[in-house]
Interface confidence: low
C-alpha cells in the first residue's frame, strides 16, 4: 500500500462531557485486522497500546485531548482527529436566564444569559446537558447569547457551563435547565447544529457578545464587533458531535 494508512475514529461513549466520578469509554476504531492500537493523551507524554480505555470514574487529571492511531505491520496510520474529554462538575453551576423572558414570539429576539461567580472567560451553551457537582463562588461574570429572529427551531431545553481558558477541559456543573418556548408557530423544534466551535475559542474583546444565528441547521458565532470565533483546524474536536456554543467573555 502506498501512502499512510487511513486515520481511525476516536469517540467517547456515552459523551465526551463527563461528570466527575461518572464512567466513560474511549474507543479507537480502525479497519478490521489491526495489529496494534495506540491511544494517547496529548500534552502528557502518556499512551496505552489498547484500543479501548474504560474510565470507571472520571477524574480531573483525565480531562484533556486524546487521539489514537494504529499499526499494521511496520506502517502507522495517520492519527485520528483529536477528542476533547471534558470533566464537568468541577466548579459550581452557573445560572442561565432568558431576557426578556423564556417565552418569546416567533420572529422576536431573546438573549440567553449565563452568569457565574467565578472569573471565568469561557462559556458553553447547550440545547441539552448533563447534571454534575458544585463549588463556592467569588465574583459575578456573565456571558450573553443573543438569538436574533427566533424560530420554532430555538424551542427546547438549554443549559450552560462556565470554564476558564487556562483549564479548558475542566468545566462547571451545568446550569439548571431553561425551557425556551417559542409561540406562534407549529414547526417541529430541531436540535442544535452538529459542528460546534472548539470550547477554547478565544475572543479578543473582554466584553464581546456572542450572536448565535441559525439558518438551515448552520450557525455562526460572531461578536457585536464582528470578531469571528472560529477554532484552528488542528484543535477541532472529534468523536460524537458536541452540541454547544462557546464564547469568550
Amino acid at each position: 500500500q502506498s501512502g499512510p494508512l487511513p486515520k481511525p475514529s476516536l469517540q467517547a461513549l456515552p459523551s465526551s462531557l463527563v461528570p466527575l466520578e461518572k464512567p466513560v469509554t474511549l474507543r479507537c476504531q480502525g479497519p478490521p485486522g489491526v495489529d496494534l492500537y495506540r491511544l494517547e493523551k496529548l500534552s502528557s507524554s502518556r499512551y496505552q497500546d489498547q484500543a479501548v480505555l474504560f474510565i470507571p470514574a472520571m477524574k480531573r487529571s483525565l480531562a484533556g485531548r486524546y487521539r489514537c492511531s494504529y499499526q499494521n505491520g511496520s506502517l502507522w496510520s495517520l492519527p485520528s482527529d483529536q477528542l476533547e474529554l471534558v470533566a464537568t462538575g468541577v466548579f459550581a453551576k452557573p445560572s442561565l436566564s432568558a431576557q426578556p423572558g423564556p417565552a418569546v414570539s416567533s420572529g422576536g429576539d431573546v438573549t440567553l444569559q449565563c452568569q457565574t461567580r467565578y472569573g471565568f472567560d469561557q462559556f458553553a451553551l447547550y440545547k441539552e446537558g448533563d447534571p454534575a457537582p458544585y463549588k463556592n463562588p467569588e465574583r459575578w461574570y456573565r456571558a450573553s447569547f443573543p438569538i436574533i429572529t427566533v424560530t420554532a427551531a430555538h424551542s427546547g431545553t438549554y443549559r450552560c457551563y462556565s470554564f476558564s481558558s487556562r483549564d479548558p477541559y475542566l468545566w462547571s456543573a451545568p446550569s439548571d435547565p431553561l425551557e425556551l418556548v417559542v409561540t406562534g408557530t407549529s414547526v417541529t423544534p430541531s436540535r442544535l447544529p452538529t459542528e460546534p466551535p472548539s470550547p477554547v475559542a478565544e475572543f479578543s474583546e473582554a466584553t464581546a457578545e456572542l450572536t448565535v444565528s441559525f439558518t438551515n441547521e448552520v450557525f455562526t458565532t460572531e461578536t457585536s464587533r464582528s470578531i469571528t470565533a472560529s477554532p484552528k483546524e488542528s484543535d477541532s474536536p472529534a468523536g460524537p458531535a458536541r452540541q454547544y456554543y462557546t464564547k469568550g467573555n
Epitope: 495506540r38 507524554s45 499512551y47 496505552q48 474504560f54 483525565l62
Partner: antibody, heavy 125, light 107 residues
Framework: VQLQQSGAELARPGASVKLSCVAS????????VNWMKQRTGQGLEWIGE????????YYNEKFKGKATLTADKSSSTAYMQLSSLTSEDSAVYFC???????????????????WGQGTLVTVSA | DIQMTQSPSSLSASLGERISLTCRAS??????LNWFQQKPDGTFKRLIY???SLDSGVPKRFSGSRSGSDYSLTISSLESEDFADYYC?????????FGGGTKLEIK
C-alpha cells in the same frame, strides 16, 4: 508481584551507572515502573517512570539529563542509567510499580503498591 | 510543584498509644494521597491509598483521613512493629512529591 533490584554500586565522579529492576509475578508490559531517590537521612524524590509496553517515559524535570529510563521486555527488566555522577547522586534508588493504562495512571489501588528493595549508589573519588 | 509538608518530623511514643501524622498539601490534591511505611531495613510498604483506603494485609489500627488540605495517618494503638519511618505521597499532578517523612521511635 516482586521487584528485584541490582546490587550496590561504587562509582567515580563523572562516571555513569546502570541500575536494574527485574519484575516478576505480573505482565511486565502492563505496569509502569517508577524510580525514586532517597539520600541518607533525607526524604524521597520521584525521578520518573517508564511504561515498558511502549517504552514511553515521563521524567521529573529535575532529573532530565541525569537519569535515563529504559526497559527490556524480553527479560522483564527496567533500567535506570545515571550519568555524570557527582556526590549529590549518592543515594539509595528504588523502583516501584503500578498497573498502567491511561486510566490506571491515576488509579490509586495499584499506585506504588509494590517496591524494590533499593540499590545503594555511592559516588566517591 | 506541589509541596507536601509532613509533621512531625520525628515522634517518640509508647506501645498502645494513639498517634497521628499529618501531611499538608500546598495545592488541592483531591484525595490523591498515599501513605507508606519504611522499615529500618529500607523496605517500603504501602499502608493507605487514596487518602483513606486500607491496603490489603494492613492492620486495621491504621487509618487515613482528610481535613481540608491536611491529610492524616492515624495509628490507634501502637505495636512494636509500627516503629519505622512514614511518608506521604501526592499523585494529583506531576511531578509526584513525597512528604519529608516522620521517624516514629519507641519511647
Amino acid at each position: 508481584v516482586q521487584l528485584q533490584q541490582s546490587g550496590a554500586e561504587l562509582a567515580r565522579p563523572g562516571a555513569s551507572v546502570k541500575l536494574s529492576c527485574v519484575a516478576s509475578g505480573y505482565t511486565f508490559t502492563d505496569y509502569y515502573v517508577n524510580w525514586m531517590k532517597q539520600r541518607t537521612g533525607q526524604g524521597l524524590e520521584w525521578i520518573g517512570e517508564i511504561y515498558p509496553g511502549s517504552g514511553n517515559t515521563y521524567y521529573n524535570e529535575k532529573f532530565k539529563g541525569k537519569a535515563t529510563l529504559t526497559a527490556d521486555k524480553s527479560s522483564s527488566t527496567a533500567y535506570m542509567q545515571l550519568s555524570s555522577l557527582t556526590s549529590e547522586d549518592s543515594a539509595v534508588y528504588f523502583c516501584a510499580t503500578w498497573r498502567g493504562n491511561l486510566y490506571y495512571d491515576y488509579d490509586a489501588e495499584t499506585l506504588f503498591a509494590y517496591w524494590g528493595q533499593g540499590t545503594l549508589v555511592t559516588v566517591s573519588a | 510543584d506541589i509541596q507536601m509538608t509532613q509533621s512531625p518530623s520525628s515522634l517518640s511514643a509508647s506501645l498502645g498509644e494513639r498517634i497521628s501524622l499529618t501531611c499538608r498539601a500546598s495545592q488541592d490534591i483531591s484525595n490523591y494521597l498515599n501513605w507508606f511505611q519504611q522499615k529500618p531495613d529500607g523496605t517500603f510498604k504501602r499502608l493507605i491509598y487514596a487518602t483513606s483506603s486500607l491496603d490489603s494485609g494492613v492492620p486495621k489500627r491504621f487509618s487515613g483521613s482528610r481535613s481540608g488540605s491536611d491529610y492524616s495517618l492515624t495509628i490507634s494503638s501502637l505495636e512494636s512493629e509500627d516503629f519505622a519511618d512514614y511518608y506521604c505521597l501526592q499523585y494529583a499532578s506531576y511531578p509526584y512529591t513525597f512528604g519529608g517523612g516522620t521517624k516514629l521511635e519507641i519511647k
